[in-house]
């Protein structure tokens, strides 16, 4: 299953399959997730080691048993790949690292006014993988405001150095935020020239294209079909690049197919997995296991659940079957692709779905009246769980926020439905940033069921929580995916990085905002909060957040929206925007429903019809 816990001061011994430099453990974990054989990783921050060569070292590891011995190493961080973790799988990495220079091939230098502008330039340059920016206070005046666009053979820095007044980060192309746009066309009987960066075997051009999209240096590809004249080159997928970023030439060639990486597509990238099953095809590779199962779909599920399995073949040969079950061959290879593809066999083959974003779990969890005042504009995909709850009577308007917690579930505040309990009048918009982008053609979700907490009473602050079941499940994308829920009764975690988001008023007597706003707000203890609200009872099922001096808060229109906190690189839904005295007033923190206290209720209500809780446990 999915394991998200990080082990501090621990290093996995042995099992190395690759190593690289990464700026933090989260980026190292992402590289492990996308590496075909990596199950575990260990990361050495700069503070953890004196050896300059090993600083920022990210070590990717495999293990036949799925685990390795941990040795104590001060400062080291270790963890698991996020394969099998559904919507948490993403190649998108937005963080900017201060005081760090990520080295690589510098191919473009320009003057820009901010690190955000530098990141945008990298994202809009086809060859840029990461960048470094020298700030206004950099020690050498001639380098100040320099934005260096970079690439490397592996897509990660060739070295990382601690350097004052330098900020570094990665391209946001994997976040589907590139302005370049992409070529969706696939060209028959055409071979591209230029430099081959990798060679893999694939059953069709679509798989070849997806592999190209997620390969750090692939810009375009040529695929040799299974009827290509040279037998040894059949089903070969050549991943390619060029200095210019486009093919310098193409040659008409029977039975070849060429196309482009889709990494520069805006707003939508293909999933990093291949779900199609290929009948009459055998995939060869290293044998991991052989099991008898009923049907090719069960074989694929078995492969997906066995984390080291990369692809499979389900044999229908009479000698491989007994009763209704046949042999399911679970296989793997060094590069994650079959080592041999044979056609016209009595088998059906396909790939593990361990890297699919979607998963089929409806709620993500972990084991172990109000709007934003003093906030700033959010950017695309920054808060992909945020939804807008709108009411359509004669006109249509935004009333509340909400959080997507599963394919078919939204968590919000019960008071949003005060006087409006009819599900037909509500429209739920997900995957949006600007309310002005909503037109009559914008898709929205309708409500199948509103589940208000049984102890909630109108105009009381207690149990201000409600679940919405959507009529149809939503697909997950970079812009629309769920937030994980905290552990039941989560009291031990100290959250220091918490944010509130919404489209609500920007001042007490204001109006709904167009662009989704965000504000970083510290949590306040319940004792402190109770002192500020002596006329109200602040219960242990509430959580408060705010600055003593005020100025930043949620406000009208933010109700029901998320209070999220980042811990160990993972966002969790800590609170639901509920109430407060005015907005952003001095010594009047915002009050939020404490989600951890309602985990039993949430899980009970989101149980599937067969009585099994459809939830994801990453830890």
């Amino acid at each position: 299953g999915c394991l998200t816990q990080l082990y501090e001061n621990a290093f996995f011994r042995g099992g190395d399959v690759a190593s690289m430099y990464t700026p933090n453990a989260q980026y190292c974990q992402m590289r492990c997730t996308f590496h075909p054989r990596c199950l575990l990783f260990s990361f050495l921050p700069a503070s953890s080691i004196n050896d300059m060569e090993k600083r920022f070292g990210c070590f990717l590891k495999d293990s036949v048993t799925g685990t390795l011995p941990k040795v104590h190493r001060t400062g080291a961080v270790s963890g698991h790949s996020l394969k099998q973790c559904g919507h948490q799988i993403s190649a998108c990495h937005r963080d900017i690292y201060k005081g760090v220079d990520m080295r690589g091939v510098n191919f473009n230098v320009s003057k820009v006014s901010s690190v955000e502008e530098c990141q945008k330039r990298c994202t809009s340059n086809i060859r840029c993988q990461f960048f470094s920016y020298a700030t206004q206070t950099f020690h050498k005046a001639e380098y100040r405001n320099n934005c260096l666009l970079k690439y490397s053979p592996g897509g990660t820095p060739t070295a990382i150095k601690v350097l004052s007044n330098v900020e570094s980060g990665f391209s946001l192309k994997p976040c589907a935020l590139s302005e370049i746009g992409c070529h969706m066309n696939i060209f028959q009987h055409l071979a591209f020239s230029d430099v081959d960066v990798a060679r893999v075997l694939t059953p069709d051009a679509f798989v070849c294209r997806t592999i190209c999209t997620y390969h750090p240096n692939c810009l375009f590809f040529t695929f040799y079909t299974n009827v290509w004249k040279i037998e040894s080159q059949r089903n070969v997928c050549l991943l390619k690049t060029s200095e210019s970023g486009t093919p310098s030439s193409s040659t008409p060639q029977e039975n070849t197919i060429s196309g482009y990486s889709l990494l520069t597509c805006k707003r939508t990238l293909p999933e990093p997995c291949h779900s199609k099953i290929y009948p009459g095809v055998d995939f060869g590779g290293e044998e991991l296991n052989v099991t008898f199962v009923k049907g090719v779909n069960v074989c694929q599920e078995t492969c997906t659940k066995m984390i080291r399995c990369q692809f499979f073949t389900y044999s229908l040969l009479p000698e491989d079957c007994k009763e209704e079950k046949c042999k399911c061959f679970l296989r793997l290879s060094m590069d994650g692709s079959p080592t041999r593809i044979a056609y016209g066999t009595q088998g059906s083959s396909g790939y593990s779905l361990r890297l699919c974003n979607t998963g089929d779990n409806s709620v993500c969890t972990t084991k172990t009246s109000t709007r934003i005042v003093g906030g700033t504009n959010s950017s695309w995909g920054e808060w992909p769980w945020q939804v807008s709850l709108q009411v359509k009577l004669t006109a249509q308007r935004h009333l509340c926020g909400g959080s997507l917690i599963g394919h078919q579930w939204v968590l919000t505040a019960a008071h949003c439905f005060d006087g409006l309990p009819l599900q037909d009048v509500w429209r739920i918009y997900s995957g949006i940033l600007n309310l002005s982008d909503i037109t009559k053609d914008t898709p929205f979700s309708q409500i199948k069921e509103i589940i208000i907490h049984q102890n909630y009473k109108v105009s009381e602050g207690n149990h201000d929580i409600a679940l919405i079941k959507l009529q149809a499940p939503l697909n997950y994308t970079e812009f629309q995916k769920p937030i994980c829920l905290p552990s039941k009764g989560d009291t031990s975690t100290i959250y220091t990085n918490c944010w509130v988001t919404g489209w609500g008023f920007s001042k007490e007597k204001g109006e709904i905002q167009n662009i989704l706003q965000k504000v970083n707000i510290p949590l306040v203890t319940n004792e402190e909060c109770q002192k500020r609200y002596q006329d109200y009872k602040i219960t242990q099922r509430m959580v408060c957040a705010g600055y003593k001096e005020g100025g930043k808060d949620a406000c009208k229109g933010d109700s029901g929206g998320p209070l999220v906190c980042k811990h160990n690189g993972m966002w969790r839904l800590v609170g639901i925007t509920s109430w407060g005295e005015g907005c952003a007033r001095r010594e009047q923190p915002g009050v939020y429903t404490k989600v951890a206290e309602y985990m039993d209720w949430i899980l009970e209500k989101t149980q599937s019809s067969d009585g099994k809780a459809q939830m994801q446990s990453p830890a």
């Epitope: 293909p270 199609k276 056609y343």
Partner: antibody, heavy 119, light 107 residues
Framework: EVQLLESGGGLVQPGGSLRLSCAAS????????MHWVRQAPGKGLEWVSG????????DYADSVKGRFTISRDNSKNTLYLQMNSLRAEDTATYYC????????????WGQGTMVTVSS | DIQMTQSPSSLSASVGDRVTITCRAS??????LNWYQQKPGKAPKLLIY???SLQSGVPSRFSGSGSGTDFTLTISSLQPEDFATYYC?????????FGQGTKVEIK
Amino acid sequence: EVQLLESGGGLVQPGGSLRLSCAASGFTFSSYMMHWVRQAPGKGLEWVSGIYPSGGWTDYADSVKGRFTISRDNSKNTLYLQMNSLRAEDTATYYCARLVAGLDAFDIWGQGTMVTVSS
Amino acid sequence: DIQMTQSPSSLSASVGDRVTITCRASQSISSYLNWYQQKPGKAPKLLIYAASSLQSGVPSRFSGSGSGTDFTLTISSLQPEDFATYYCQQSYSTPRTFGQGTKVEIK
């Protein structure tokens, strides 16, 4: 010129049999996966059956499974569809089609042959 | 089996009009989607493969888009020879299934 030419259609009684042929020319027939697709009068297209180049793997729509058999003779560049236990609902124009390798689209179609099942 | 639903089932348009036909799959089919044109008494003809790629010899006024479950065929400026029935077809899984067709008629 790449071409597919069907033959063998006609009028047959319910329960009867018929064998359709599809002669290919202008391309290396033995390299391509071939399929049969049918269209009932005034209706849409329905995939019927497919066969790999070597003939080692065949596939059928549920509606014809156990009654129809697809086969090929690569030495004669010909595709066949043996239809047994014919029913009135099998009445249709039958097209043979070539599948583009690596893309899974029917790029070349024959002109079709009409099969009428009626008493 | 994957169901393919086309809309509208028929439409009337004039020469020069922009025409859009949609096709929805009952489950995600990635980009494994093809479009065909069929004229009365003739065999179907491949127009678009892989959701958006134009088959050789097909005029550039035809274009396709979409991925996952929702797909669109667009004719930017309808010509007299474009009056026909259009079918979408998924090749993601067997049985390969077609939409019920959209008949484009002269207004």
